[in-house]
């Protein structure tokens, strides 16, 4: 059966701004056939970020990740890092796209919908008008996902390819870098309702994370380049909505003008978009930014949630 | 407004354990990591870990893993470290951060915790 | 790990001084550095962080810059209120570092 290993399905329009190795879980280097090269950058939100391979940021985020990868394997544990090519996966994955990726669809793929459990925070702090799609690049080995502990991943939200609803979709994302403990959509995350006293080596698999707590530490994203603004901490929190693309202060490259083309093989169930809290900061959404990606709402089961005042931005009142 | 408040001090013997707790209002819990941080007398500051509240999943300096277990009780909007097997150098200050989410630092932060262990 | 050394430790100065504290990270933390100010018996406060964005309610007068691994924090004319012990944290990697501190005493 042919995958389009070959075929371009993930190119960038935009390169994001710095983003803290800490928040990110791995990384992917694009096909030769996507012409433009670039790095695909993913956080522990599960939110795909296109990156300049260029720039010494980008050099030294990858080689922390392989570094982390090295010492995953070491430790017994199997880590997939493959370049330059997206298989199909089948397990499902969350994740957002930079505004400036584009996925392609891939020959074949099928698609399952399953409930996303990405950390909120970093959804927190997503706001604007993105639509969720019930497609979403795998995680590497199926391993799951670090989780995301604030609301949003670190990583310049503006930027962001949209975030995606953990359907398996025909893009396979390959990880070099080892998965964080946190919600995934590998793994349901649970959470110690009660303190527990476990050692902290097993207190990770009660948190549901097969792979070494390590790598992207803090998630929550909160607007990059933010002060001690309010965090959200209501029903307009993004709990109560569908992702929507966050334009921060701290990624001022990212605009309007930058926006994510996604072509995805219909899915045969539609995902169910993930609810992450609003993004807040001291930035105004824009609610009239028209969503950017080329595909059909019906055809892909598009989520596209109204996006709250700013006054609802802020991040805790 | 948002609010960190921890547990008072405690005094233990070394080879005890203790529970230090750090209880949050103000925003949506689950939504933001807690960070704690070890401040020795005259020392600076050391970070130790965090955990998510939203899944419950830690993140540990290598330099604390092994007597310290991070975890969360969403119902109460608390979190709480457990330091076992207490020995003199564990001495300190314990505080609970909190901070963004596009990157790791702390702009809430608790009143601390003082930890003093002792025979 | 990133090792963060802060100087001077300590430094003495009078009201309306300007003041500079530098902080050197052992590896490139791509400006994710974040500066605090803590005063006896109390938490840290978050004054500045990506280098050079003040945290909401720091006076202006604070200010930070660098890049690579060489960051400073002045303050442009010191006031009683600033006499405290100031810390840098880096959060480009985990774990998460802080500089030794430096402390500043009033003159």
């Known amino acids: 059966q042919h995958h389009g290993v070959t075929k371009c399905n993930i190119t960038c329009s935009k390169m994001t701004s710095k983003i803290p190795v800490a928040l990110l879980i791995h990384y992917q280097q694009n096909q030769a056939s996507c012409g433009k090269r670039a790095i695909i950058l993913e956080t522990r939100q599960h939110r795909l970020f296109c990156a300049d391979p260029k720039e010494q940021w980008v050099k030294d985020a990858m080689q922390h990740l392989d570094r982390q990868a090295a010492a995953l394997t070491r430790n017994g544990g199997t880590f997939e890092k493959q370049i330059g090519e997206v298989k199909p996966r089948t397990t499902p994955a969350a994740g957002g796209m930079d505004e400036s990726v584009v996925l392609e669809p891939e020959a074949t793929g099928e698609s399952s919908s399953l409930e996303p459990t990405p950390s909120s925070q970093e959804a927190q702090r997503a706001l604007g008008t993105s639509p969720e799609l019930p497609t979403g690049v795998t995680g590497s080995s199926g391993t799951r996902l670090p989780p995301t502990p604030k609301a949003q991943d670190g990583g310049p939200v503006g930027t962001e390819l949209f975030r995606v609803p953990p359907v398996s979709t025909a893009a396979t994302w390959q990880s070099s870098a080892p998965h964080q403990p946190g919600p995934s959509l590998w793994a349901e995350a649970k959470t110690s309702e009660a303190p527990s006293t476990q050692d902290p080596s097993t207190q990770a698999s009660t948190a549901s994370s097969p792979a070494p707590e390590e790598n992207a530490p803090s998630e929550g994203q909160r607007v990059w380049g933010q002060g001690q603004s309010p965090r959200p901490e209501n029903s307009l929190e993004r709990e109560e909505m569908g992702p929507v693309p966050a334009h921060t202060d701290a990624f001022q490259d990212w605009g309007p003008g930058s926006m994510a083309h996604v072509s995805v093989v219909p899915v045969s169930s539609e995902g169910t978009p993930s609810r992450e809290p609003v993004a807040s900061g001291s930035w105004t959404p824009k609610a009239e930014e028209p969503i950017h990606a080329t595909m059909d709402p019906q055809r892909l089961g598009v989520l596209i949630t109204p996006v709250p005042d700013a006054q609802a931005a802020t991040r805790r009142q | 407004q948002v609010q960190l408040v921890q547990s008072g001090a405690e005094v233990k013997k070394p080879g005890a354990s203790v529970k230090v707790s750090c209880k949050a209002s103000g925003y949506t819990f689950t939504n933001y990591y807690i960070h704690w941080v070890k401040q020795a007398p005259g020392q600076g500051l050391e970070w130790i870990g965090w955990?998510?509240?939203?899944?419950?999943?830690?993140k540990f300096n290598e330099r604390f893993k092994g007597r310290t277990t991070l975890t969360a009780d969403k119902s109460t909007n608390t979190a709480y470290m457990l330091l076992s097997s207490l020995r003199s150098e564990d001495t300190a200050v314990y505080f609970c951060a909190t901070g963004p989410t596009d990157g790791d630092y702390f702009d809430y932060w608790g009143q601390g915790t003082t930890v003093t262990v002792s025979s | 790990d990133i090792q963060m050394t802060q100087s001077p430790s300590s430094l003495s100065a009078s009201v309306g001084d300007r003041v500079t504290i530098t902080c050197r990270a052992s590896?490139?933390?791509?400006?994710?550095l974040a500066w605090y100010q803590q005063k006896p018996g109390k938490a840290p406060k978050l004054l500045i962080y990506n280098e050079k964005t003040l945290a909401d309610g720091v006076p202006s007068r604070f200010s930070g810059s660098g890049s690579g691994t060489d960051y400073t924090l002045t303050i442009s004319s010191l006031q009683p209120e600033d006499f405290a012990t100031y810390f840098c944290q880096q959060f480009w990697s985990t774990p998460y570092t802080f500089g030794g501190g430096t402390k500043v005493e009033i003159k």
């Open positions: 590896g490139n933390i791509h400006n994710f």
């Open positions: 955990i998510y509240p939203g899944d419950g999943s830690p």
